[in-house]
C-alpha cells in the first residue's frame, strides 16, 4: 500500500520504533529485558517485566508467587494473571470462616437448616446458609424436603457450620500440609510434565458422590466430585483440566467443576497450532526466528553468536549479540542431573532421561 510508505519511513528513521506490516503501523520497540503487553506497543508503558509462570508482577514491579488453590477445600475463582495473583475461594457447598490474602485459610460446609427452618439465604463461598422459621405457606426458598418441614418450637437462625475434615487452620496456600509423598498420586496425573514430581501433592481419595451443597435425603442436588485440577465432563467422568504451565501459555479461564481450564498464548505471542482448550504451539508475534542468523563457531573456543539483520528489517525481537569484549575463556561442562526417582515414578511421554550439563555446561542426566 503506497499510502503506508510515509508511516514506514518514519519508523525506519527512529531506532526506538519498528514498522509492523501486520498491523501497518509503527510500534514502540520494548527495551531489552522488557516484554510487550500488546501486539504493537505504542509507548514505554506498554512494556513490562516478564515473570515466570505462576508469578505475577506486583505493584512494586516485583515478580511474586500467585497463591495456589490446591487444598482440597479450595477452587480457583480467578486465574493467575501477569499483574494479579490467582484468587481462591471455598469449594461449592462450603464458605470461608477465616479469610487470607487472595484465598481462604479455613472453609466450613454450609449448614443444613434444621427441622422447622427453611433457607432464607443460600450459602455462598463467603457466607454460611441463613435459616428462618418456616412460614405457613410453602416458601420459594424451600430447596429440599429437608428444609421444608413443619415448624417446631424454638427457632435457630443459623445452624452450626461443619468444618471440613480435617479442619485446616493454617493460612497456607501451598499444596498439602504434612509431607504427603508426591509419588502417591503420580499414576493418575497423566498430563504432567515428565520431570514434574506431581501436579498436586495430595493423596487422592475416592471421588464418590459429593453435593454441590450438602446433600440431604431427598435432595437431587448431588453430583460426583472430582479431584482438584479435574472436571466432570459431559459423560460424567472426572477428566484432567489442561495445564497452562508451559512457558508460553497463560490461563484464560480456570478449571471449574464442570469445565476444563483453557489456556491461551502469552501476550506478545500468537497461536500457530491450536489444541483442545489450549494452544499446542505459540510463536512470538511478530515471528522473528527466521530473521536471526546463526554463525556457527567452535563451541570449545567461543560460543555461538547471533547476528541481527540490519536495523529496521526485524520487528521487536531481541537477539542477544556478543558484546564487544575479547573472547571469554570457556570453563568445563556442568551437568545438571534431574532426580531420576522423580521421573521414574511418573508416566513419561519421552524415553530420554532429563539431564542438565553445565560447562563453563549443566546437563540433566538422570543416568
Amino acid at each position: 500500500f503506497p499510502q503506508d510508505r510515509p508511516f514506514e519511513d518514519t519508523c525506519h528513521g527512529n531506532p526506538s520504533h519498528y514498522y509492523d506490516k501486520a498491523v501497518r503501523r509503527c510500534c514502540y520497540r520494548c527495551p531489552m529485558g522488557l516484554f510487550p503487553t500488546q501486539q504493537c506497543p505504542q509507548r514505554p508503558t506498554d512494556c513490562r517485566k516478564q515473570c515466570e509462570p505462576d508469578y505475577y508482577l506486583d505493584e512494586a514491579d516485583r515478580c511474586t508467587a500467585c497463591v495456589t488453590c490446591s487444598r482440597d477445600d479450595l477452587v480457583e475463582k480467578t486465574p493467575c494473571a501477569w499483574n494479579s495473583s490467582r484468587v481462591c475461594e471455598c469449594r461449592p457447598g462450603m464458605f470461608c470462616s477465616t479469610s487470607a490474602v487472595n484465598s481462604c485459610a479455613r472453609c466450613f460446609f454450609h449448614s443444613v437448616c434444621p427441622a422447622g427452618m427453611i433457607v432464607k439465604f443460600p450459602g455462598t463461598a463467603q457466607k454460611n446458609t441463613v435459616c428462618e422459621p418456616a412460614s405457613p405457606g410453602v416458601s420459594p426458598a424451600c430447596a429440599s424436603p429437608e428444609n421444608c418441614k413443619e415448624p417446631s418450637s424454638g427457632t435457630i437462625p443459623q445452624a452450626k457450620p461443619t468444618p471440613v475434615s480435617p479442619a485446616t487452620s493454617s493460612a497456607s496456600t501451598m499444596p498439602v500440609r504434612g509431607g504427603t509423598r508426591l509419588a502417591q498420586e503420580a499414576a493418575s496425573k497423566l498430563t504432567r510434565a515428565p520431570d514434574s514430581p506431581s501436579s498436586v501433592g495430595r493423596p487422592s481419595s475416592d471421588p464418590g458422590l459429593s453435593p454441590t451443597q450438602p446433600c440431604p435425603e431427598g435432595s437431587g442436588d448431588c453430583r460426583k466430585q472430582c479431584e482438584p485440577d479435574y472436571y466432570l465432563d459431559e459423560a460424567g467422568r472426572c477428566t484432567a483440566c489442561v495445564s497452562c504451565s508451559r512457558d508460553d501459555l497463560v490461563e484464560k479461564t480456570p478449571c471449574a467443576w464442570n469445565s476444563s481450564r483453557t489456556c491461551e498464548c502469552r501476550p506478545g505471542m500468537i497461536c500457530a497450532t491450536s489444541a483442545t482448550n489450549s494452544c499446542a504451539r505459540c510463536v512470538p508475534y511478530p515471528i522473528c526466528a527466521a530473521e536471526t542468523v546463526t554463525k556457527p563457531q567452535d563451541m570449545a573456543e567461543k560460543d555461538t553468536t547471533f547476528e541481527a539483520p540490519p536495523l529496521g528489517t526485524q520487528p521487536d525481537c531481541n537477539p542477544t549479540p556478543e558484546n564487544g569484549e575479547a573472547p571469554a575463556s570457556t570453563s568445563p561442562t556442568q551437568s545438571l542431573l534431574v532426580d531420576s526417582q522423580a521421573s521414574k515414578t511418573l508416566p513419561i511421554p519421552t524415553s530420554a532421561p532429563v539431564a542438565l550439563s553445565s560447562t563453563g555446561k549443566p546437563v540433566l542426566d538422570a543416568g
Epitope: 508467587a65 510434565a193 514434574s196 501436579s199 542426566d365
Partner: antibody, heavy 111, light 107 residues
C-alpha cells in the same frame, strides 16, 4: 576454570531429556563456605532475561535453542567472583523451588 | 530484597538425636519456602518445598513446618549420612533469596 582479574569467562549448561524451551533456566552462585545467591534466569524460548540487581553488570545470560544450551558470561572478573556457579531448573510448579541442579562450574580468579 | 536468617550457623549432633533448624524471613513469604541439603562437594538437593512438603524420595525423618516468616526443618532422628549444609530459600518474590546455611556435623 581459572581466569585472570579483569578477564571474562563464559560457562554453559546443556540440558537434555526435556523440552529446553519449556522451562526457564536459573543460575546460582556459591562462594566457598557461604550460602547460595540467585543470579538471574533466562526464558530460552524468548531469550527474555531477568537479573538480581547485584549481578546486572556482572552476568549476561543467553541460550541456544538449537543445542539446548544455556550460557552465562561473567565479565570484569575479580576475586569476589571466585565461586561455584550452578544452573538450576524448576518443575512445572515454579513456586516449589529447584529440584534439578547442574553439578556446578568452579571459577577461580587469580593473577 | 527478602532476607532469610538461618540459625544456628552450625551444630554437632549424635546419631539418633532430633535436630531442629530455623529459618526466619524479613517479611511474609507465605509458605513459599524450600529446604535444600548440600553434602560436601555436591550440588544442593531439594528436601522440602512449600514449607512442609517432602520432595520425592526424601526420607520421612525430614519434616518442614511454618508459614509467614518463621520456618523450621526437623530431622527426627539424625543419621550419619545427614552430615551436610542445609539451606532455606524463598520462592515467594524475586529476586529469589537463600539463607546463609546451617552446617550439621555428626559427633
Amino acid at each position: 576454570a581459572a581466569a585472570k582479574p579483569g578477564a571474562a569467562v563464559k560457562m554453559s549448561c546443556k540440558a537434555s531429556g526435556y523440552t529446553f524451551t519449556d522451562y526457564w533456566m536459573h543460575w546460582v552462585k556459591q562462594r566457598p563456605g557461604q550460602g547460595l545467591e540467585w543470579i538471574g534466569y533466562i526464558n530460552p524460548n524468548t531469550a527474555y532475561t531477568d537479573y538480581n540487581q547485584k549481578f546486572k553488570d556482572k552476568a549476561t545470560l543467553t541460550a541456544d535453542k538449537s543445542s539446548s544450551t544455556a550460557y552465562m558470561q561473567l565479565r570484569s572478573l575479580t576475586s569476589e567472583d571466585s565461586a561455584v556457579y550452578y544452573c538450576a531448573k524448576k518443575t512445572t510448579q515454579t513456586t516449589w523451588g529447584f529440584p534439578f541442579w547442574g553439578q556446578g562450574t568452579t571459577v577461580t580468579v587469580s593473577s | 530484597d527478602i532476607v532469610l536468617t538461618q540459625s544456628p550457623k552450625s551444630m554437632a549432633m549424635s546419631v539418633g538425636e532430633r535436630v531442629t533448624l530455623s529459618c526466619k524471613a524479613s517479611e511474609n513469604v507465605d509458605s513459599f519456602v524450600s529446604w535444600y541439603q548440600q553434602k560436601p562437594g555436591q550440588s544442593p538437593k531439594l528436601l522440602i518445598y512449600g514449607a512442609s512438603n517432602r520432595y520425592t524420595g526424601v526420607p520421612d525423618r525430614f519434616a518442614g513446618s511454618g508459614s509467614g516468616r518463621d520456618f523450621t526443618l526437623t530431622i527426627s532422628s539424625v543419621q550419619a549420612e545427614d552430615l551436610a549444609d542445609y539451606h532455606c530459600g524463598q520462592n515467594y518474590r524475586y529476586p529469589l533469596t537463600f539463607g546463609a546455611g546451617t552446617k550439621l556435623e555428626i559427633k
